[in-house]
């Protein structure tokens, strides 16, 4: 039986241009993490495996950098970035887990709506 | 002016499905997620999902994941809602919404499209 | 998925009255920024809902200023200061920062 929950960063507004970290945390369960997946729809992000660590996505390799933990931080974000993304656990003996993050990248004159845009 | 004109009401056969639009005028499509919200009862609100016209990106409820298919056509500033096999259960006003940018609200919706499961 | 509690689910009011509706969420809806995501909906009958305040307490354009909004963490409130014949009809808020997205079950502001 599966009775792990996963906790994430939260739903995240950012500006174009700046950096954000996607953070998932896996709790309430004594499984083992054997990987984690990040993907944007039906892309491959990065893989962070507990035997043989981390591995970013060629196309992604110059903007997602590994971390902190098992998060992924995006940088020189762009509007096309916008969208969800998942952390996908996959545990032993429960199985997978999955958390969602959707990422809304906005071009930097929305600022006049008083939004608090995260640049780390 | 922000406007969101949806089609008008629906009665569809058990097990049929059928598609709902929602045309967009008085602000840059591409530039707002648009939102799918069903009402049932006359009352509850529950939140369907979400398309990002600029990448195609969309986000979905699980609970209509298979249920619902978003889509949108930029050309014509629409965005549509697919329902599949629909049954008595899925009666009910759906309303589509621009999202508010950087606070994931709604803030301008369409009048509501009514649909109607029925035999 | 995080659930909405509003309460109460009734209220019942005469115009000139002030009142607060309370909603509460089974997780902290402020995010790793500091942003928390919860707006609050009028739907009066035969209408659209409309939005009243995004981002806790931030009233949307033309939204009279009777209204406000307070909270954090899990704990919101929307006030109305002075309640007139326009303001009936179905409260609800809304949390955005977890996915999918969830309303609370309504609270009806109807006259006494």
């Known amino acids: 039986m599966m009775t792990g929950t996963i906790e994430t960063t939260g739903n995240i507004s950012a500006e174009k241009g700046g950096s954000i970290i996607l953070q998932c945390h896996l709790s309430s369960t004594t499984a083992q993490v054997t990987q984690v997946n990040w993907e944007q729809q039906d892309q491959l992000l990065a893989i962070c495996n507990a035997d043989l660590g981390w591995h970013i996505s060629p196309s992604f390799k110059d903007r997602v950098a590994p971390g902190p933990g098992l998060g992924l931080t995006l940088q020189s974000l762009t509007v096309n970035d916008t969208g969800e993304y998942f952390c996908i656990y996959h545990t032993y003996p429960d199985g997978t887990y999955t958390g969602r993050i959707f990422l809304e990248v906005l071009e930097s004159s929305v600022a006049e709506h008083g939004a608090r845009f995260q640049i780390p | 002016e922000v406007q969101l004109q949806q089609s008008g009401p629906e009665l569809v056969r058990p097990g049929g499905s059928m598609k709902i639009s929602c045309k967009a005028s008085?602000?840059?499509?591409?530039?707002?997620?648009m939102n799918w919200v069903k009402q049932s009862h006359g009352q509850n609100l529950e939140w369907i999902g979400l398309?990002?016209?600029?990448?195609?990106?969309?986000s979905y409820n699980q609970k209509f994941q298979g249920k619902a298919t978003l889509t949108v056509d930029k050309s014509s500033s629409t965005a549509y809602m697919e329902l599949l096999s629909l049954t008595s259960e899925d009666s009910a006003v759906f309303y589509c919404?621009?999202?508010?940018?950087?606070?994931?609200?709604?803030?301008?919706w369409g009048q509501g499209t009514s649909v109607t499961v029925s035999s | 998925d995080v659930v909405m509690t509003q309460t109460p689910l009734s209220l019942p009011v005469s115009f000139g009255d002030q009142v607060s509706i309370s909603c509460r969420s089974s997780?902290?809806?402020?995010?790793?920024?500091?942003?928390?995501?919860l707006s609050w909906y009028l739907h009066k009958p035969g209408q659209s809902p409309q939005l009243l305040i995004y981002?806790?307490?931030n009233r949307f354009s033309g939204v009279p200023d009777r209204f406000s909004g307070s909270g954090s963490g899990t704990d919101f409130t929307l006030k109305i200061s002075t309640i007139k014949p326009e303001d009936l009809g179905m409260y609800y808020c809304?949390?955005?920062?977890?996915?999918?997205?969830?309303f609370g079950g309504g609270t009806k502001l109807e006259i006494k």
């Open positions: 398309i990002i016209p600029y990448n195609g990106g969309s």
């Open positions: 008085g602000y840059s499509f591409t530039g707002y997620t």
């Open positions: 919404a621009r999202g508010l940018r950087g606070y994931f609200a709604m803030d301008y």
């Open positions: 809304l949390q955005g920062t977890h996915q999918p997205w969830t």
């Open positions: 997780q902290n809806l402020t995010n790793s920024y500091g942003n928390t995501y």
């Open positions: 981002g806790i307490s």
